[in-house]
């Protein structure tokens, strides 16, 4: 009897460890995507950035999907979303089309069930990048806590994409799940 | 028999509470370090900031180590890292060496096993701090989600360190563990 | 005997699921509050923003309270706090009182037991918004990890409130609990 109870207890402990481990890992999707600058569009208009790395350098993804330039949620939950976008210009790249710039980022959520797109977060600045200086740089950081449903898609739009800094430490966005939806 | 089973159950519940509590606390290292401005260097070069508070005011640390100016990871995991850096200048401090400034922060990771240093995040802006204005201020915020291994070190580099705002609410960096590595 | 043990095991599993679920949800308060621009004060001085949405659009709250313009902590813990504040001006709104602006945000903590207010985080920039440009924009982001006690209150102060961007994706602040206090 006592031996049997111990076996049952071991089962309880074992199954709990499994359950705890499994639920813990399942409950925490994440992604950190870094810019893939081989295909940066030109112009000063607002564009959706579709080329991101998800598996090299600092870039990584787990329990989420990256497809068609969008970060797809696989698991309902509350997530912390963030983006860091750096813009830069050097005189050796040629003159700017205008010295007055609007350097912006928009983090958007698209629901494919009800096709619609909404901006979750925005940030940026108007800048006067004068020809008196040979080099210009500016970074934007945004972050916030959002309810995301499975199948929803997160994407990044920026103005003046040709001015993006292509370094992985400069231009990136990401998400990590903090908690379930009640 | 029934009493014995209840005792076993209590043991299961008790050990689980202990295990859950222990694993929960062990699994969540964090740090929030605020600038110690007693010894800020002069110059406009990039410098690694080595003086930070870890146990006064808003500064705190748990299950991580602060040593030799670096935040040392004691536990493998995925962490959210962040930094907020404020620069300021008042004309009463004397003239700036130049009105054109590059105000930058770099969050770096150093691996001591294979001595190497890599920038995880960067941010900042080029600024024109004209003599027409008596006071200038600028803040940078960066944040991101990174895999860190035990023994790796996080440090902060800034340009123009003499312009740092020494307040604990202005210049700080930190980290908190979000999840284990699978 | 064996049936009784299985029943006990089911109880253990069941109570554990309850306990795990309950503790998990209880342990994770959060809030994401977006600006309510129907009542934005004028002037360039520093003011506490008291009008925020907590239950429409992206705004949400759980296990925290929003009252009298402040986010009230209901549960001791370590929280990640963040704020994103956007300022903008278009010439159609009329001339600025001055072209030299100090656009700032302060995230403050108030303890009601010992009436006192302290700034946890600050950010911003001095800006020269010249009349040469018809539109100006600037965003600030701050974030950090803080120990908060039940009853403490978080509020947002900004300079130049009349320049705030009233969009929910632009001007918001929030918090989520990361871990218990040991």
């Amino acid at each position: 009897g006592s031996q049997h109870i111990r076996a049952e207890k071991a089962m309880v402990d074992g199954s709990w460890l499994d359950l705890a481990k499994r639920s813990k890992l399942e409950a925490q999707p994440f992604a950190h995507l870094t810019i893939n600058a081989t295909d940066i569009p030109s112009g000063s208009h607002k564009v959706s950035l579709s080329s991101w790395y998800h598996d090299r350098g600092w870039a990584k993804i787990s329990n989420m999907t990256f497809s068609n330039g969008k970060l797809i949620v696989n698991q309902d939950g509350f997530y912390y979303l963030y983006a860091n976008i750096c813009f830069r210009h050097h005189e050796t790249s040629g003159d700017l089309a205008t010295e007055y710039l609007q350097l912006m980022v928009y983090v958007t959520k698209t629901s494919i069930k009800i096709p619609s797109s909404h901006t979750l977060m925005k940030g940026g600045s108007t800048k006067y990048w004068s020809g008196n200086s040979e080099f210009h740089f500016y970074s934007i950081n945004v972050g916030g806590f959002f309810k995301l449903r499975s199948g929803e898609e997160i994407s990044i739009e920026v103005s003046n994409p040709s001015l993006l800094d292509p370094d992985q430490d400069a231009t990136y966005f990401g998400a990590f799940k903090v908690r379930d939806i009640d | 028999g029934s009493q014995h089973i209840r005792a076993e159950k209590a043991m299961v519940d008790g050990s689980w509470l202990d295990l859950a509590k222990r694993s929960k606390l062990e699994a969540q290292p964090f740090a929030h370090l605020t600038i110690n401005a007693t010894d800020i260097p002069s110059g406009s070069h990039k410098v690694s900031l080595s003086s930070w508070y870890h146990d006064r005011g808003w500064a705190k640390i748990s299950n991580m180590t602060f040593s030799n100016g670096k935040l040392i990871v004691n536990q493998d995991g995925f962490y959210y890292l962040y930094a907020n850096i404020c620069f300021r200048h008042h004309e009463t401090s004397g003239d700036l060496a130049t009105e054109y400034l590059q105000l930058m922060v770099y969050v770096t990771k150093t691996s001591i096993k294979i001595p190497s240093s890599h920038t995880l995040m960067k941010g900042g802006s080029t600024k024109y701090w004209s003599g027409n204005s008596e006071f200038h201020f600028y803040s940078i915020n960066v944040g991101g989600f990174f895999k860190l291994r035990s023994g790796e070190e996080i440090s902060i580099e800034v340009s123009n360190p003499s312009l740092l705002d020494p307040d604990q609410d202005a210049t700080y960096f930190g980290a908190f563990k979000v999840r284990d590595i699978d | 005997g064996s049936q009784h043990i299985r029943a006990e095991k089911a109880m253990v599993d069941g109570s554990w699921l309850d306990l795990a679920k309950r503790s998990k949800l209880e342990a994770q308060p959060f809030a994401h509050l977006t600006i309510n621009a129907t009542d934005i004060p004028s002037g360039s001085h520093k003011v506490s923003l008291s009008s925020w949405y907590h239950d429409r659009g992206w705004a949400k709250i759980s296990n925290m309270t929003f009252s009298n313009g402040k986010l009230i902590v209901n549960q001791d813990g370590f929280y990640y706090l963040y704020a994103n504040i956007c300022f903008r001006h278009h010439e159609t709104s009329g001339d600025l009182a001055t072209e030299y602006l100090q656009l700032m945000v302060y995230v403050t903590k108030t303890s009601i037991k010992i009436p006192s207010s302290h700034t946890l985080m600050k950010g911003g920039s001095t800006k020269y918004w010249s009349g040469n440009s018809e539109f100006h924009f600037y965003s600030i982001n701050v974030g950090g990890f803080f120990k908060l006690r039940s009853g403490e209150e978080i509020s947002i102060e900004v300079s130049n409130p009349s320049l705030l961007d009233p969009d929910q994706d632009a001007t918001y602040f929030g918090a989520f609990k990361v871990r218990d206090i040991d």
Partner: antibody
Framework: SVEESGGRLVTPGTPLTLTCTVS????????INWVRQAPGKGLEWIGY??????AYYANWAKGRFTISQTSSTTVDLKMTSLTIEDTATYFC?????????????WGQGTLVTVSS | IVMTQTPSPVSGAVGGTVTINCQAS??????LAWYQQKPGQPPKLLIY???ILASGAPSRVSGSGYGTEFTLTISGVQCADAATYYC???????????FGGGTEVVVE
């Protein structure tokens, strides 16, 4: 690469300008340092310049030495009131990415001889 | 800030280990570099940020230290290591010289 030029024999009191010419990298995201070495002696830092043409000098060099950016690829070192003690090989060195403790690219140096 | 190097000269046998010390008059954190210079040549960067091996530097060379005390170690000494070694603080411009006085390494 970096290359120094302008070194020559001069008499005491004569002013002299040395030029550092860079290629393959930007002056605006790197420091340019001037360092000198008297015959048989150690290295002596003079100063640096970086973005925005902000120049910083060793305490002893302030006033008599001036570092300036003269084009997108050249940095000058102007020296006045030269004395015999200024006889040295003058090096130009890049501080990688504005790192000052990472002078990773040095020129071969240009010799300045001050003699009456 | 004053940088002081000891000893000089220092001798080491082929295959042995040589240690050079550098002391800063006040804390410079980890903002320190080491250079090797041979006669008639410009200095060559070996170590930066006190312990990071520079590109092209041999892995036999290592750096350590923090604050005011720093060490350069050359293990498995070779004849090619005969040179003068300099430490350099990269912390503050408020200095007369950012370099130490140099340490000559003689290989026997």
């Amino acid at each position: 690469s970096v290359e120094e030029s302008g070194g020559r024999l001069v008499t005491p009191g004569t002013p002299l300008t040395l030029t550092c010419t860079v290629s393959g990298f930007s002056l605006y995201t790197n420091l340019i340092n001037w360092v000198r070495q008297a015959p048989g002696k150690g290295l002596e830092w003079i100063g640096y310049i970086n973005y925005g043409a902000s120049a910083y000098y060793a305490n002893w060099a302030k006033g008599r030495f001036t570092i300036s950016q003269t084009s997108s690829t050249t940095v000058d070192l102007k020296m006045t009131s030269l004395t015999i003690e200024d006889t040295a090989t003058y090096f130009c060195a890049r501080g990688y990415g504005n790192d000052w403790d990472r002078l990773d690219l040095w020129g071969q140096g240009t010799l300045v001889t001050v003699s009456s | 800030i004053v940088m002081t190097q000891t000893p000089s000269p220092v001798s080491g046998a082929v295959g042995g280990t040589v240690t050079i010390n550098c002391q800063a008059s006040q804390s410079i954190g980890s903002n320190l570099a080491w250079y090797q210079q041979k006669p008639g040549q410009p200095p060559k960067l070996l170590i930066y940020s006190a312990s990071i091996l520079a590109s092209g530097a041999p892995s036999r060379v290592s750096g350590s230290g923090y604050g005011t005390e720093f060490t350069l170690t050359i293990s498995g000494v070779q004849c090619a290591d005969a040179a003068t070694y300099y430490c350099q603080q990269g912390y503050t411009t408020n200095a007369d010289n950012i370099f130490g006085g140099g340490t000559e390494v003689v290989v026997e």
